[in-house]
Amino acid sequence: IYGGQKAKPGDFPWQVLILGGSTAAGALLYDNWVLTAAHAIYEQKHDASSLDIRLGALKRLSPHYTQAWAEAVFIHEGYTHDAGFDNDIALIKLNNKVVINSNITPICLPRKEAESFMRTDDIGTASGWGLTQRGLLARNLMYVDIPIVDHQKCTAAYEKPPYSGGSVTANMLCAGLESGGKDSCRGDSGGALVFLDNETQRWFVGGIVSWGSMNCGEAGQYGVYTKVINYIPWIKNIISNF
Amino acid sequence: TGWKIHYTSTAQPCPYPMAPPNGHLSPVQAKYILKDSFSIFCEPGYELLQGHLPLKSFAAVCQKDGSWDQPMPSCSIVDCGPPDDLPSGRVEYITGPEVTTYKAVIQYSCEETFYTMKVNDGKYVCEADGFWTSSKGERSPPVCEPVCGLSARTTGGR
């Protein structure tokens, strides 16, 4: 997380640390599912049990976490590895239900009405243990509040060199400051971009940390997130069938 | 031209059956003689027991020696047994401590703050069929679902 601050206990109780080939993140759904980015766990798709999933952690290097293990990995069938980031979404089924408490709580899925809390300039919050402006993985869970960026503006930002190959699709949303300095970064992948539903006073997942500029927090570039509301039927279908 | 002897006999009646408490007898007759039978039916919420063994039905037949072919059963109150545990929740006995018999009431509840009850209000009654049943007729216990989207950022620390 670039330009963020330290999270306090209970701030992001849905935050999941995923260790496999690299450091990634996810968000707890219900008490036995983790929502994450397809690119973050693609290498482990046939070896779910190799994923080391940690919940209730605030510090990346603390032994005080709740250990969970993957029973199965579900990568969106429309995701193609190393060919852009469209449909960059995945679900992990945990082998056991976790006990919910103030440090481990699931994130809500967006209601149909949630788009009214995710308009341009509405503030979302990204969190993770990814690279900070110091160029190192964060020891403490960090978070940053960032506004949603107009889709056309974001698409245009990634049409300029050297990003001319970067395709911002309708399945993505962008967030960040035009001036830069606040962003998610490598190691934050799979984590939730969350929004407060003002009617229910509950947080919901609007985006999944997916991709962005080569230099995190770069001015004129934005973080790109998987647009979760587009995938509610897919998520519900998998969770109800498995 | 010989003798003709006409025999007449009066059947030895069996002892008059007394229905067990919470049961009734059918058919009701003035007396029961050889080959007559009766059945015992228990009131709703009670079940037929012969000793400790449950019976689906009971019928006794009067034998030629004036005895019934089997002893009178009892009608014992239906016991639904201890209710299923509720993961992330608890069960409270409303009727009385550990009372699990017919018409007893229990109340399921979920752990406050972090879980909420799905399906029904959590109130179950021990019915005549021996099952704990909710007001909506469900026999399976409720489910405690995690509450989503809670954060110390909006609750000011928990």
Epitope: D52, K59, L61, S62, P63, H64, Q67, R139 | -
Partner: antibody, heavy 121, light 106 residues
């Protein structure tokens, strides 16, 4: 090389307190958690708790919550374990041990030599 | 708390013998750790994450297992291996140790 050197043996009276030190060298002290364990004579190992050397956050097992206090001094790369209201059953060898930071973070890759604490009237 | 039960509690063996120590957990654990302790000395890490050899530990030591049953094997016992061995888990809080297995010279 990586080393943890503990303070010497102590004899204490019941009701007293004892403070054991553990000086670390050969690694970045603040990168690791420091754990404290004990071993009563002829017995197995028992975990007391740990301290994060980067920010002094502590965790104790229930049994020691009220009597054990773990602290650190970053400037001297030293960890301390104080145990109060001593009783005879606290007689044991007390160990500091460094927490791993490579995999699960849940084991001890370097141990101090141990400090014998005897509680006797 | 997860209870760890080591068996045997003690064993007598000769140099060159293959020795197996088991550690049975009261509920499933993901990873097991093994330590060696000699009299008057601190424990020393042998095996981490069930089967990985700690730095500087001879290859005659190996760990295996899953779920509730884990094993430490010494393929060919050496004179310096006579010691007490402990298993440890932290799959569930709090971390716990086995009661130890003492390996003595026959």
């Amino acid at each position: 090389q990586v080393q943890l050197v503990q303070s010497g043996a102590e004899v204490k009276k019941p009701g007293a307190s004892v403070k054991v030190s553990c000086k670390a060298s050969g690694y970045t002290f603040t990168n690791h958690h420091m754990h404290w364990l004990r071993q009563a004579p002829g017995q197995g190992l028992e975990w007391i708790g740990d301290i994060d050397a980067s920010d002094s956050e502590t965790h104790y097992i229930e049994k020691f919550k009220d009597r054990a206090t773990l602290t650190i001094d970053k400037s001297s790369s030293t960890a301390y374990m104080e145990l109060s209201s001593l009783r005879s059953e606290d007689t044991a060898v007390y160990y500091c041990a460094r927490g791993d930071i490579t995999t699960t973070l849940r084991y001890f890759d370097v141990w101090g030599q141990g400090t014998l604490v005897t509680v006797s009237s | 708390d997860i209870q760890l039960t080591q068996s045997p509690s003690s064993l007598s063996a000769s140099v060159g013998d293959r020795v197996t120590i088991t550690c049975s957990a009261s509920s499933s654990v993901r990873y097991m750790y093994w330590y060696q302790q000699k009299p008057g000395k601190a424990p020393k890490l042998l095996i981490y994450d069930t089967s990985n050899l700690a730095s500087g530990v001879p290859s005659r030591f190996s760990g295996s297992g899953s779920g509730t049953d884990n094993t430490l094997t010494i393929s060919s016992l050496q004179p310096e291996d006579f010691a007490t061995y402990y298993c440890q888990q932290w799959s569930s809080y709090p971390l716990t140790f086995g009661q130890g297995t003492k390996v003595e010279i026959k």
